[in-house]
Interface confidence: medium
């Protein structure tokens, strides 16, 4: 779906890879969506090269995006979600590449927020919730969420629990006595929507209690 | 040139079940929405149903859900409606239209010539 | 769903008469409205999209106008051929869903 320039006044941009990668965030602000576009190549030079959308619009053709550092970014209402866009890499009027994009397959839901956990001592087992935006959304409301805890001494020993909910229940028992542990959140689009994992919630960190000798419980 | 052909029309029995088939040529199918809309003798459009392109975005109208099914193959450039448990209501002209979603809001810019179900004991 | 409410049902007009047809929404749509011509035995045929935007290839004495929730479509001069039924078409995009006023008649006087 990516081409490159062909015309001999651009002679420079042909050797350059102006792939190029999106995500779209649905009612993000508001009623608004937006659409991000970053080259895959770091080291594009970007001066003078605009991105384009067209198609399945609201009202207008064609849409600019905003230049901000390294990203392009456009947020308005006016994505129809119906069909697919064509974004093009411009110079000019002269257009680089081109990708056939419907904004419903490449959604990056919001991040998970308010991440925190409960010790239950009367059942021993420790209850995760968080909250998401998304419950309050017409579109994108239907999320699979990855919840990803560790030890915090075993840096990439991390395990993983998908659920559709916003609370999951750790047995105390899977779990290290007496050992501090980071957990954290993401979301994926499930149902209609496609895309992309969100970013991480920020991580909250709890300690579990200690081995009772007694009982072989955790304090 | 921008094409589509309906066929599987006919006369059927209430209770029957009936399969309409568009072929569409002329323009890049699996970049569009596809509709079926009905007109009945001497009434107006129905829309019927519609599939966005991809399959995962589908809509029926409140006169034929739970009856029809909407599906295309876009391998063959062909949309299907298989039509279940008809009635002497669903007698009409069916439409199988193309969306043209570029030129900003939904709106069917191409239509096939119509099939014809007829719905009768 | 929004319901669109064409008027009249039926008009009779001359050639070279200037007409207009209304198409009123339940609910504001903004300009997500489309016009149809149907000739008897014939398929529809796009002209207006956009509320106001001329389908390539129609006649410029065809026009677009309204936003929100009236709309109207005028023909400046009618010639022969413009005697036909005249459709109003809105959209939703999720849930999926089309809806077509009830039309509006022409007939030649």
């Known amino acids: 779906e990516s081409g490159y320039a062909q015309n001999g006044d651009l002679e420079d941009a042909e050797l350059d890879d102006y792939s190029f990668s999106c995500y779209s965030q649905l009612e993000v602000n508001g009623s608004q969506h937006s659409l991000t576009c970053a080259f895959e190549d770091p080291d594009v030079n970007t001066t003078n090269l605009e991105f384009e959308i067209c198609g399945a619009l609201v009202e207008v053709k064609c849409l600019n995006f905003r230049k901000l550092q390294e990203i392009y970014f456009i947020e308005t209402k006016k994505f129809l979600l119906i069909g697919k866009s064509n974004i093009c890499v411009k110079v000019g009027e002269k257009s680089l590449t081109c990708k056939k994009i419907d904004l419903t397959t490449i959604v990056k839901p919001e991040a998970p927020f308010d991440l925190s956990v409960i010790y239950r001592e009367g059942a021993n087992d420790f209850v995760v919730t968080f909250n998401t935006s998304h419950l309050q959304k017409k579109y994108v409301k239907v999320l699979m969420h990855d919840v990803a805890y560790r030890q915090e001494k075993d840096e990439n020993k991390w395990t993983h629990v998908n659920l559709s909910s916003t609370k999951l229940t750790l047995l105390q028992r899977k779990l290290q006595p007496a050992a501090m542990y980071e957990i954290k959140v993401r979301s994926i689009p499930d149902h209609y929507f496609k895309g992309f994992w969100s970013e991480w919630s920020p991580s909250y960190y709890f300690r579990t209690p200690e081995i009772n000798n007694s009982s072989g419980e955790m304090d | 040139e921008v094409q589509l052909v309906e066929s599987g029309g006919g006369l059927v029995q209430p209770g029957r079940s009936l399969r309409l088939s568009c072929a569409a040529s002329?323009?890049?199918?699996?970049?569009?929405?596809m509709h079926w809309v009905r007109q009945a003798p001497g009434k107006g459009l129905e829309w019927v149903s519609g599939?966005?392109?991809?399959?995962?975005?589908?809509g029926y109208a409140d006169s034929v859900k739970g009856r029809f099914t909407i599906f295309r193959d876009n391998a063959k450039n062909s949309l299907y409606l298989q039509m279940n448990s008809l009635r002497a209501e669903d007698t009409a002209l069916y439409y199988c239209?193309?969306?043209?979603?570029?030129?900003?809001?939904?709106?069917?810019?191409?239509w096939g010539q119509g099939t014809t179900v007829t719905v009768s004991s | 769903a929004i319901q669109l409410t064409q008027s009249p049902s039926s008009l009779s007009a001359s050639v070279g008469d200037r007409v207009t047809i209304t198409c009123r929404a339940s609910?504001?749509?903004?300009?997500?409205l489309a016009w149809y011509q149907q000739k008897p035995g014939k398929a529809p045929k796009l002209l207006i999209y956009?509320?106001?935007s001329l389908e390539s290839g129609v006649p410029s004495r065809f026009s677009g106008s309204g936003s929100g929730t009236d709309f109207t479509l005028t023909i400046s001069s009618l010639q022969p051929e413009d005697f036909a039924t005249y459709y109003c078409?809105?959209?939703?995009?999720?849930?999926?869903?089309?809806?077509f006023g009830q039309g509006t008649r022409l007939e030649i006087k």
């Open positions: 239209a193309k969306d043209e979603y570029s030129r900003g809001y939904y709106v069917l810019d191409v």
């Open positions: 002329g323009f890049t199918f699996d970049d569009h929405a």
């Open positions: 599939i966005s392109w991809n399959s995962r975005g589908i």
């Open positions: 609910a504001g749509i903004s300009s997500a």
């Open positions: 956009d509320a106001s």
């Open positions: 078409q809105q959209f939703n995009s999720y849930p999926l869903w089309i809806t």
